[in-house]
Amino acid sequence: QPSVSPGEPSPPSIHPGKSDLIVRVGDEIRLLCTDPGFVKWTFEILDETNENKQNEWITEKAEATNTGKYTCTNKHGLSNSIYVFVRDPAKLFLVDRSLYGKEDNDTLVRCPLTDPEVTNYSLKGCQGKPLPKDLRFIPDPKAGIMIKSVKRAYHRLCLHCSVDQEGKSVLSEKFILKVRPAFKAVPVVSVSKASYLLREGEEFTVTCTIKDVSSSVYSTWKRENSQTKLQEKYNSWHHGDFNYERQATLTISSARVNDSGVFMCYANNTFGSANVTTTLEVVDKGFINIFPMINTTVFVNDGENVDLIVEYEAFPKPEHQQWIYMNRTFTDKWEDYPKSENESNIRYVSELHLTRLKGTEGGTYTFLVSNSDVNAAIAFNVYVNTKPEILTYDRLVNGMLQCVAAGFPEPTIDWYFCPGTEQRCSASVLPVDVQTLNSSGPPFGKLVVQSSIDSSAFKHNGTVECKAYNDVGKTSAYFNFAFKGNNKEQIHPHTLFTP
């Protein structure tokens, strides 16, 4: 019983004056609370609470369920308690079979005893199975049995409270322990796509997948540098014990340019947080940007191959691609493919393969591409380098020798005179007239050059060489002269191929 200090409020006193009372089932429970400021009696067992405003608590025929703590409280809020055991051989345990434990915490198996004098109060596995070796517990007849530091491996463990009564083991009803896992790692988060490119008015939808050991993981979509709550839809799965998956889908039904930005899926648990981001770019209309992978002015030697290559960005996806030359569309010799197999790829490559180009195949090669919003094109000017070809070499009526040569780049024509029978013509002769003629062929074709010299300058027998050359090669033509008295004759001109 409490000691009383004069002048200070004191707790009530209870009769009988002991902390514990044992009564037999069917007997009377009579508890008297003495206090000038009596307020109430309170009875507690498991989750049950009863109150009584009478200062004497009387239960005429005690039952096992009357086992519990009886507390008397006065107007000062001071209280005193007595614990009553109602011994019932047929009901040794009071039970609340709800049994949840948090991993690494203690949890109480609520099976308080109705008889404190039974022995070997402990836990046992169901159907004779042993308890886990590392399971430790502390029995308390008034509360139950405390399992220390619950492990995840105990999930769904079947248990009985057990006592020995008159040499026999008596088991309570069974308990199933449900373990709520502790978070021992951050959630695993992933996003359906790392970046999105949309046109105004299109729907933006992105899904974040969150995986963790339980559904109590928190997750949300956030817009970077914004506090606005985003509209999310959720879906969840239980894939087995401690294997939970949630999908959080963020949707903007009609995206606008100002919706562009970085969106973060954030998840956290008591261990820590994780996040993943996705980038949204909204454009007012589609686009195509073409990037030539080689110079758009191309020089290639006659008979050689060249690949015209472009990369281009197209959004939305390209619908039509073509290569054109001289108003004709190539049906083959080209290929078009995405730069990567990535779902969000907008970059593509197109290659036109030109093989064994002829001098006549120079010109403008155009790549055209279109999507639902725009068209774009790029032109390549292809020049075929050709060795000069001497088209004509004549003695004109006015006594001029004329040489006309074609090639690309533009040929240069030099003249040489070889006196007598010498093979090498080294003495150069200056032309009287040099003209570049307009070719009647296609643009980018060979360039035609005409050069003339005055034959009256030659006073001896010999050979005149017309030599046309450029970066690719050279070709010569020869005029033979013989004098008969004062008359000069042109003998058959001839050309020599010089590689």
Epitope: Y100, S215, S219, S236, W237, H238, Y244
Partner: antibody, heavy 119, light 107 residues
Framework: EVQLLESGGGLVQPGGSLRLSCAAS????????MSWVRQAPGKGLEWVSA????????YYADSVKGRFTISRDNSKNTLYLQMNSLRAEDTAVYYC????????????WGQGTLVTVSS | DIQMTQSPSSLSASVGDRVTITCRTS??????LNWYQQKPGKAPKLLIY???RLESGVPSRFSGSGSGTDFTLTISSLQPEDFATYYC?????????FGGGTKVEIK
């Protein structure tokens, strides 16, 4: 002892709104996902909505999506269901239920509150 | 959404009979199936969770079995207090869905 007590039901006209509440006691409210389940007169059970323990994640049946909003106030141990644009077919007894351990069903139910949508 | 097909929709049986109710799902749900009992004017009561696990306080004459898409609730020996409507429910994937119910009546 776990207890769930629904309130807020009543008669409402089509197109109207109601807010149901469910007061929880006897357990750590924030540890448990909670659900609303309804039962039209003479019909079976229909799951309506659920919310995670933190209130971060919410789930809805297709029949109520966009009209109903589930929420919770863990400081008050209370679950809510805001029902807008009510239709005659929403007439039912609405139960609040506690989700047991993950995926293991609803182990505690309230007594239900009747919502009647009629003109 | 996962569809739940419960059969039969009703059955008549006598006290002591063995009663079997089946539930089929439109896709595999592992073992995430629960069974409830509901009596007129009362809230449902969880009987079986995770397909085969008996909820605390539920008599052992109730048992559940199955996994994947096919599940069964069995009452080994029907008692007078077992006359009620029984529902299956999947909690594998949201939206969680219930079967149509099976009413067990006295023959």
């Amino acid at each position: 002892e776990v207890q769930l007590l629904e309130s807020g039901g009543g008669l409402v006209q089509p197109g109207g709104s109601l807010r149901l509440s469910c007061a929880a006691s006897g357990f750590t409210f924030s540890d448990y996902p909670m659900s609303w389940v309804r039962q039209a007169p003479g019909k079976g059970l229909e799951w309506v909505s659920a919310i995670g323990g933190s209130g971060g994640d919410t789930y809805y049946a297709d029949s109520v999506k966009g009209r109903f909003t589930i929420s919770r106030d863990n400081s008050k141990n209370t679950l809510y269901l805001q029902m807008n644009s009510l239709r005659a077919e929403d007439t039912a007894v609405y139960y609040c239920a506690r989700g047991a351990y993950d995926g293991e069903g609803f182990d505690y139910w309230g007594q239900g509150t009747l919502v009647t949508v009629s003109s | 959404d996962i569809q739940m097909t419960q059969s039969p929709s009703s059955l008549s049986a006598s006290v002591g009979d063995r009663v079997t109710i089946t539930c089929r799902t439109s896709q595999s749900i592992g073992s995430y199936l629960n069974w409830y009992q509901q009596k007129p004017g009362k809230a449902p009561k969880l009987l079986i969770y995770s397909a085969s696990r008996l909820e605390s306080g539920v008599p052992s004459r109730f048992s559940g079995s199955g996994s994947g898409t096919d599940f069964t609730l069995t009452i080994s020996s029907l008692q007078p207090e077992d006359f009620a409507t029984y529902y299956c429910q999947q909690t594998y994937n949201t939206p969680w869905t219930f079967g149509g119910g099976t009413k067990v009546e006295i023959k």
